[in-house]
Structures are given as structure tokens and as C-alpha cells.
């Protein structure tokens, strides 16, 4: 969590952002909330990313002004309209792109004053995996498979009864590009896996750490899978 | 009531510049997008590029470099040149609002000019 | 450029009745899709954007859904107004990309 205050001549208002990760090919949002003013009209909202020379999103006067807004983020940016009078200046960003990382400003004037803060925006590819019985396999044989990841993550393995056991041995990872160039595919294979057994793909990279959770018993099978956006750090 | 008027031939011979004005009556042109959008007879609709009152545009890669889109905020109108046409430019041209910076649909259109590429 | 692909052609539905209109994208876009009705001689009318939420003005009959690459526009209790083609249009990504369209028709 990121609190910035505002700078000297006016009052300072308090602004305040929190970290955040973008999926690329999907849709983000940059979060910034400020102290409210009652009145639209007198709200003046900036969101600017370090090295870029034009604007990423400019709202006053109770709506957008783009006339400023650097290319690489034309039709692609909106505030939450409604929910500027209430102090919610968080960015919606279309289409995440790599390039979009980098640190950003939520900077606000209001009748109170001006303040801003920072944010620092990662972007990679992150998705739920998938565990299923391997029937094709020889022996017993578990699959994790998760569509879309970048950066590269790693895969670890690991089983309710066998706790701490190093499953690398009996594993294999592969990793394939996705049409897009950018992703790929993750694949990871469990061999000699035993019944009554709770088995945990877990996949990481600097961005995500997901677990996608296999329960194997003689007369069912359950799964599970969880996903965590890691460094999600406000200021 | 947002209203968008195209004007300009309905005739354009082969090679030359098909030009059309879409007049914006109702409402400002300041703070919007405006776009182009293209039907050919009988087929689908084919966006053919923006403009922001700014004056930032984008186009169509298909259409390559033949297009320019400019704007006039004191006569509240923007214009479309097409350079080099062909037949396979014959189409019904509309003009039409952006309904917002993030979701690029458009909310009002003009009725629509025909305009015919032929000797 | 992302290619929207519409089924069916052509739908054949009787008035009362319940339109089901598909729209695929060769990419994901998100929920970054609009729909339009088109009448003969006239300019296409926004009826969805967002997916799934209704343009003003629009009845409460058209209804859209979806994400990612699947879409639907369902149209429950036709109207006799209702007989159109229909587009789908995509504004995930430059350049912006209409479907084919789906002619909707009295059975």
C-alpha cells in the first residue's frame, strides 16, 4: 500500500494505491482511492506512467479529456465514473500488454488540495491449473496442465501423506509456446502416484503462484485449484 | 438528441479520392471519438478508422495508407479521404459516435451515404 | 487483426419464440464485444456493449453473455420488430472487427 500526500501551496490530500499484477490479453485494473470532494466538477484525475510523455488517462470536469493521452493507451483506459465522487480514482486498462509494466501516478487535485501516489504495475500470464488421472499413462500417473503463463514459472509437486517428499525425480515439466509468441502452456506429469492420496501441483513465477489439488481415492476423485496475484503491496 | 449527417458525391471514378463530411448536430464533438464504418452492398460492415477532436487518429491497416480523417471542431464535422479508389471501395459509408474511450461501440450512426466507384 | 465469426447465416424463428445468436472470436477479447441490430435501408443500432449490458433505450429482451471467445445474443419473446440481421463486433484490439452477421428471419 502506497499514501502519498500532496505537494506544498494548497492542503495536501491523502491518495493512496495498491501494487498490482495484469493478465496480458485480458483486462486489468489499476487501483488509486482519495480523500472524496462533493463536488465532480472540482475533481481533477491523472494517471501517468514513468517514461511515457503523454497522459495514460486524464477525467475533469466529470468526464474523460484525451486529448493529451499518450498512443500506446488510446481506447484502452476509463475511471469507474460513477464512483469518482466517492474517491475511487482506479484505472480500467483493456488488453494488458507486456509493455504496460512500470510505475505508475494517481495524481489528484480536488477543492481540499492535490496529492498523488505511485504504483507499480507487473504484467505477465498467469492461469489455473488443472489436475486429471493420466489413464493413457502405463502406471498411475498424474497431469497438471495450466494454459497460459509467462514469465516461465517453475512446477513443484508435492502430497499430503508423502509431506516434504521431493517429487523431481518422478515428475516432468514441459513448457509450450502459445500462438501468440509470448505464453506457453504448462505441462507437468506425477508418476507412480498411489491411491487415497492428496496430490498438489503448485506453479510460481514472480507474478502468480497457483495450486491446482488432485484427491484420488478407490471410489472418487475431487479437485481443487486456487490462484494468488503475489507483491500486492499498497502505498 | 445526437444527430450525424453524411454529405458528399455519390459518384467516384476509378483512382480518384472519395471524399465525405459528417456533420454533428446536438452535441459537441469535443470529447468523443468518432469513427467511420463501411458496408458494401449486400456484405458486413468493415470499420474503417477514428478521429478524437484532439485530432489523434488511427486506421485501418487493410486500408493501408489511402485513408486520412481529419476534424473541424469549429464547424462541428469530421471528414474522410479514401485516395486511389476502386470498385471494391462501392460501399454504403456511415459515420458514428464512440460510445466511450473504453467501450468502442457506437452509439449513434448517420443514415448512411452510398457511394459508387465506377468510370 | 481478430476474426469474429457469427452462426448461424441464417435463423429461422417464429415469433414468441426464444433467438439464440452465436458470435466466436479467433482470440480472447475479454468481455470487449458489442452487438447491433441492422434493418434493410437503415444504420445498425447498438444493442449490447460489454458484453452483456443493454444500450439505452433497449428492451429488456435482448440479453447478451459471454467472454473470452464465446458469445451470445439471446432474444426471448420475439417481436415482430425484431426480424434484422445481427453483428457482432469486437474492440479488444486494433483494428476494430465485425462478424459476418446472422440474418434473423420469421419462420
Known amino acids: 500500500l502506497i499514501i502519498g500526500f500532496g505537494i506544498s501551496g494548497r492542503h495536501s490530500i491523502t491518495v493512496t494505491t495498491v501494487a498490482s499484477a495484469g493478465n496480458i490479453g485480458e483486462d486489468g485494473i489499476l487501483s488509486c482511492t482519495f480523500e472524496p470532494d462533493i463536488k465532480l466538477s472540482d475533481i481533477v484525475i491523472q494517471w501517468l506512467k514513468e517514461g511515457v510523455i503523454g497522459l495514460v488517462h486524464e477525467f475533469k470536469e466529470g468526464k474523460d479529456e484525451l486529448s493529451e493521452q499518450d498512443e500506446m493507451f488510446r481506447g484502452r483506459t476509463a475511471v469507474f465514473a460513477d464512483q469518482v465522487i466517492v474517491g475511487n480514482a482506479s484505472l480500467r486498462l483493456k488488453n494488458v500488454q507486456l509493455t504496460d509494466a512500470g510505475t505508475y501516478k494517481c495524481y489528484i487535485i480536488t477543492s481540499k488540495g492535490k496529492g498523488n501516489a505511485n504504483l507499480e504495475y507487473k504484467t505477465g500470464a498467469f492461469s489455473m491449473p488443472e489436475v486429471n488421472v493420466d489413464y493413457n499413462a502405463s502406471s498411475e500417473t498424474l497431469r497438471c496442465e495450466a494454459p497460459r503463463w509467462f514469465p516461465q514459472p517453475t512446477v513443484v509437486w508435492a502430497s499430503q501423506v508423502d509431506q516434504g517428499a521431493n517429487f523431481s525425480e518422478v515428475s516432468n515439466t514441459s513448457f509450450e509456446l502459445n500462438s501468440e509468441n509470448v505464453t506457453m502452456k504448462v505441462v507437468s506429469v506425477l508418476y507412480n502416484v498411489t491411491i487415497n492420496n492428496t496430490y498438489s501441483c503448485m506453479i510460481e513465477n514472480d507474478i502468480a503462484k497457483a495450486t491446482g489439488d488432485i484427491k484420488v481415492t478407490e471410489s472418487e476423485i475431487k479437485r481443487r485449484s486456487h490462484l494468488q496475484l503475489l507483491n500486492s503491496k499498497a502505498s | 438528441q445526437v444527430q450525424l449527417q453524411e454529405s458528399g458525391p455519390g459518384l467516384v471514378k476509378p483512382s480518384e479520392t472519395l471524399s465525405l463530411t459528417c456533420t454533428v448536430s446536438g452535441g459537441s464533438i469535443s470529447s468523443y471519438y468518432w469513427s467511420w464504418i463501411r458496408q458494401p452492398p449486400g456484405k458486413g460492415l468493415e470499420w474503417i478508422g477514428y478521429?478524437?477532436?484532439?485530432?489523434?487518429?488511427n486506421n485501418n491497416p487493410s486500408l493501408k495508407s489511402r485513408v486520412t480523417i481529419s476534424v473541424d471542431t469549429s464547424k462541428n464535422q469530421f471528414s474522410l479521404k479514401l485516395i486511389s479508389v476502386t470498385a471494391a471501395d462501392t460501399a454504403v459509408y456511415y459515420c458514428?459516435?464512440?460510445?466511450?474511450?473504453?467501450?468502442?461501440?457506437?452509439?449513434?450512426w448517420g443514415q448512411g451515404t452510398l457511394v459508387t466507384v465506377s468510370s | 487483426e481478430i476474426v469474429m465469426t457469427q452462426s448461424p447465416a441464417t435463423l429461422s424463428v417464429s415469433p414468441g419464440e426464444r433467438a439464440t445468436l452465436s458470435c466466436r472470436a479467433s482470440q480472447s477479447v475479454s468481455s470487449n464485444l458489442a452487438w447491433y441490430q441492422q434493418k434493410p435501408g437503415q444504420a445498425p443500432r447498438l444493442l449490447i456493449y460489454?458484453?452483456?449490458t443493454r444500450a439505452t433505450g433497449i428492451p429488456a429482451r435482448f440479453s447478451g453473455s459471454g467472454s473470452g471467445t464465446e458469445f451470445t445474443l439471446t432474444i426471448r419473446s420475439l417481436q415482430s420488430e425484431d426480424f434484422a440481421v445481427y453483428y457482432c463486433?469486437?474492440?479488444?484490439?486494433?483494428?476494430?472487427?465485425f462478424g459476418g452477421g446472422t440474418k434473423l428471419e420469421i419462420k
Open positions: 458514428a459516435r464512440v460510445y466511450n474511450n473504453y467501450d468502442w461501440g457506437f452509439d449513434y
Open positions: 478521429i478524437y477532436y484532439s485530432g489523434s487518429t
Open positions: 460489454g458484453a452483456s
Open positions: 463486433q469486437q474492440y479488444h484490439n486494433w483494428p476494430l472487427t
